[in-house]
Interface confidence: low
């Protein structure tokens, strides 16, 4: 692996500053496969080609990330560049067969995310679970997941159920949960950060 990532980076580094900006705007609205989330716009707009490549791969994995990048390039009228990207990607082995969707995976980041580090404490101490669910619904949680968490009788069991979904989340999804925690129970986050 790595060939698709390099091909994405090559393509993005060959865009002009204006084209890169246009790429980002189009990326915000390109139709996504079921199960994949959108890269938050605020973070996206400030990224250079290298950061954006890493973000695309962490959000969508190499194969789908390359496909998505090619789709956006084609939508921008850069058919030749899109074709080169796809050609470079398909030269490598290990590309998933068409139609097979790998689920979003965790971004490759050093160490554990705050959410994972403090899993036990969060299960025990979060009280405003409904607020978290509303903040995550439609971005990280599906309707079924949302309802499943709400159906649990106590806050700890709600949080335990919520954590049962986090293995499929990438780093940014976990950041969303952390941000929601900061907004709803900032004192708890501050306490855990000090510990």
């Amino acid at each position: 692996m790595g060939r698709a990532r390099d091909a994405i980076l090559d393509a993005l580094e060959n865009l002009t500053a204006e084209e890169l900006k246009k790429f980002k705007l189009k990326l915000l609205s390109v139709p996504l496969r079921e199960g994949y989330g959108r890269i938050p716009r605020g973070a996206l707009l400030s990224m250079d080609a290298l950061d954006l490549t890493d973000k695309l791969v962490s959000f969508y994995l190499e194969t789908y990330g390359a496909e998505l990048t090619a789709n956006v390039l084609r939508d921008m009228g850069l058919q030749e560049m899109a074709g080169q990207l796809q050609a470079a990607t398909h030269q490598g082995s290990g590309a998933a067969p068409a139609g097979i969707q790998a689920p979003p995976q965790s971004a490759a980041k050093p160490g554990l995310h705050f959410i994972d580090q403090h899993r036990a404490a969060l299960i025990a101490r979060v009280t405003n679970v409904e607020w978290l669910l509303d903040a995550l619904y439609g971005k990280v949680l599906t309707d079924e997941q949302y309802q499943a968490v709400r159906a649990e009788p106590t806050n700890p069991s709600k949080m335990r159920k919520l954590f049962s979904f986090t293995p499929a989340w990438n780093w940014t999804c976990k950041d969303l949960l952390l941000q929601a925690l900061r907004e709803s129970q900032s004192y708890l986050v501050e306490d855990l950060e000090r510990s």
Partner: antibody, heavy 123, light 107 residues
């Protein structure tokens, strides 16, 4: 208090242009996109386009690309929309509306709306 | 462009009734659906974001639900101040589009 104050009603001739303004107050102007929405009498809402005041990057609804030009002046925290080659079809209320663009979550909805400017195109 | 179809076009209710307003999208919009209220001669006001998330300052009688292509705004025990137009808006794809609106009127 967050407010979007729009310019007054306009009565204009067909074929001419008009420039509408939207003055923002109560928040950091460059932290939010500003969008424009059209509403014809008794009808629904149509998104015209939006501008990021921090760098004047614009995104238009293809339908309005030849009709509207969006600009922003950060020194006065004011967004503008110029409408050209006006016809009776352009008679409508035009709203500016802000859209949050935080660094953590993309907020693709309009949380504050302007007072609206009525444009009447008539000879 | 994604087309949003709202129904019914007009809903006549008595204060105290509970109502549901529908918004159907021409393709899946993955919960990127928001609701606005517009009273006569006023600007629209955001009611619900992302299908079901509440907005500060909006009464709790307003709630939203749905997924895929079908979305609903519910008003539990309508009050006289609730009468007016209601619009849905999708932000899944450019261009942003709005529904044609549902007029909530007094019976």
């Amino acid at each position: 208090q967050v407010q979007l104050q729009q310019s007054g009603a306009e009565l204009v001739r067909p074929g001419t242009s008009v420039k509408l303004s939207c003055k923002a107050s109560g928040y950091t102007f460059t932290s939010y996109w500003m969008h424009w929405v059209k509403q014809r009498p008794g009808q629904g809402l149509e998104w015209i386009g939006g501008i990021d005041p921090s760098d004047s990057y614009t995104k238009y609804n293809q339908k309005f690309k030849a009709k509207a030009t969006l600009t922003a002046d950060t020194s006065s925290s004011t967004a503008y929309m110029q409408l050209s080659s006006l016809t009776s079809e352009d008679s409508a209320i035009f709203y500016c509306a802000r859209e949050e663009a935080s660094t953590v979550v993309a907020h693709w909805y309009f949380d504050v709306w302007g007072t609206g400017t009525t444009v009447t195109v008539s000879s | 462009d994604i087309v949003l179809t709202q129904s019914p076009a007009t809903l006549s209710v008595t204060p105290g009734d509970s109502v549901s307003l529908s918004c159907r999208a021409s393709q899946s919009i993955s919960n990127n659906l928001h609701w606005y209220q517009q009273k006569s001669h006023e600007s629209p006001r955001l009611l619900i974001k992302y299908t079901s998330q509440s907005i500060s300052g909006i009464p709790s009688r307003f709630s939203g639900s749905g997924s895929g292509t079908d979305y609903t705004l519910s008003i539990n025990s309508v009050e006289t101040e609730d009468f007016g137009m209601y619009f849905c808006q999708q932000s899944n794809n450019w261009p942003y589009t709005f529904g044609g609106g549902t007029k909530l009127e007094i019976k």
